[in-house]
Interface confidence: medium
């Protein structure tokens, strides 16, 4: 029962992570530039995202513009876009794999096969979490680097946008949820670890470990 509870918790976390990731990727709030300081009356705020940028005037009016051409975009932005989409698709794939191996489904009958699928889905979710983390950390690094660059005009110094925080949250949830799924899978059936060793010798190293044998730092 504890195993089932952890599985459900893991999936709920990954689902929350996926939704956070989707919102993070979609929102144009990766970089925020507040045009204050050098012209105090012109309190314009620029939000930049992966797909569009928005200008919020001091009057409260907001204008958004979708980026024109894919090829004209900077390479780091193109890479961030690609990684974001791949991460979301990978997480969706992980969900499908989990559903196939979930205790409450009949897609797969054998308990040990179900356990393997749950483990696989956990690994896929962890990969998705890492893929989500890369563009978020890269963008944050660029913002911080520019912030401390004396040549960058003060008015153009950006701040970390809400999307980055959502991205970190998404990555954390995917890693945590995936980690929980990886931890629950060895107790997938009544058979002990030796049973797995006998029946699935080729994949034994991946699924014969008890939860205590996994280095916990991988799932933090």
């Amino acid at each position: 029962m504890a195993s089932a509870g952890m599985q459900i918790l893991g999936v709920v976390l990954t689902l929350l992570g996926w939704v956070n990731g989707l919102v993070s990727c979609a929102l144009p709030m990766w970089k925020v530039t507040a045009f204050i300081g050098n012209s105090i009356v012109v309190a314009q705020v620029v939000w930049e995202g992966l797909w569009m940028s928005c200008v919020v005037q001091s009057t409260g009016q907001m204008q958004c513009k979708v980026y024109d051409s894919l090829l004209a975009l900077p390479q780091d932005l193109q890479a961030a876009r690609a990684l974001c989409v791949i991460a979301l698709l990978v997480a969706l794939f992980g969900l499908l794999v989990y559903l196939a191996g979930a205790k409450c489904t009949t897609c797969v009958e054998e308990k040990d096969s179900k356990a393997r699928l749950v483990l696989t889905s956990g690994i896929v979710f962890v990969i998705s979490g890492v893929l989500t983390l890369i563009p978020v950390c890269w963008t944050a690094h660029a913002i911080i680097r520019d912030f401390y660059n004396p040549l960058v005009a003060e008015a153009q110094k950006r701040e970390l946008g809400a999307s980055l925080y959502l991205g970190w949250a998404a990555s954390g949830l995917l890693l945590l949820g995936g980690g929980l799924l990886c931890c629950t899978c060895p107790s997938g059936g009544s058979q002990g670890p030796s049973h797995y060793m006998a029946r699935y010798s080729t994949s034994a190293p991946a699924i014969s470990r008890g939860p205590s044998e996994y280095p916990t730092k991988n799932y933090v």
């Epitope: 045009f35 050098n38 012209s39 105090i40 012109v42 930049e48 960058v152 005009a153 008015a155």
Partner: antibody, heavy 118, light 107 residues
Framework: QVQLVESGGGVVQPGRSLRLSCTAS????????MHWVRQAPGKGLEWVSF????????NYADSVKGRFTISRDNSKNMLYLRMDSLRAEDTAVYYC???????????WGQGTLVTVSS | AIQLTQSPSSLSASVGDRVTITCRAS??????LAWYQQKPEKAPKSLIY???SLQSGVPSRFSGSGSGTDFTLTISSLQPEDFATYYC?????????FGQGTKLEII
Amino acid sequence: QVQLVESGGGVVQPGRSLRLSCTASGFTFSHYGMHWVRQAPGKGLEWVSFLWFDGSKDNYADSVKGRFTISRDNSKNMLYLRMDSLRAEDTAVYYCARNGGLTIFDYWGQGTLVTVSS
Amino acid sequence: AIQLTQSPSSLSASVGDRVTITCRASQGINSWLAWYQQKPEKAPKSLIYAASSLQSGVPSRFSGSGSGTDFTLTISSLQPEDFATYYCQQYNFYPYTFGQGTKLEII
């Protein structure tokens, strides 16, 4: 309406000094950063200097750093450019321009000609 | 300093033509690029800011695009009053820099 009027230009010998003024009207001068931009005869535009709305920060082009000083008097709606150790290559029309934040140089003056010649 | 290279440096066109001027930055300047129009013996006039936003009062036949290092100014249908010199300018890094200008002449 927004108006910027430069004055103080003229002919000056190399090594001497000159002070340009820019009178602003039609907007709350103390709320806006201000720039000086110059244009040598028959040449392109060159940004010279920028001063924040409250005079707390300034920036200069490398070609004038240490020789030119930008300042302002918000009570008089005036922007100044003090030019020392003038060189022949400083000969240009000098424009003052308002910093509109995101819109950068949104309003310009008509310019004042500075000729550095012996 | 960031170098801005405009091309072409001069351009001949007729009224009604569609014209495109490009501006390339020596390194990424995000979207912090403006375009100006200057007529002989006159002060420059702001056309486009933040790469693609039209300055208020500027006709909609003017448009800007680009991000990073490559930018374009497009005039969809040239009018007689559009014949002038056009400059791009970056305001991401100090010192702020201008392109060398593109002179648009009438055929």
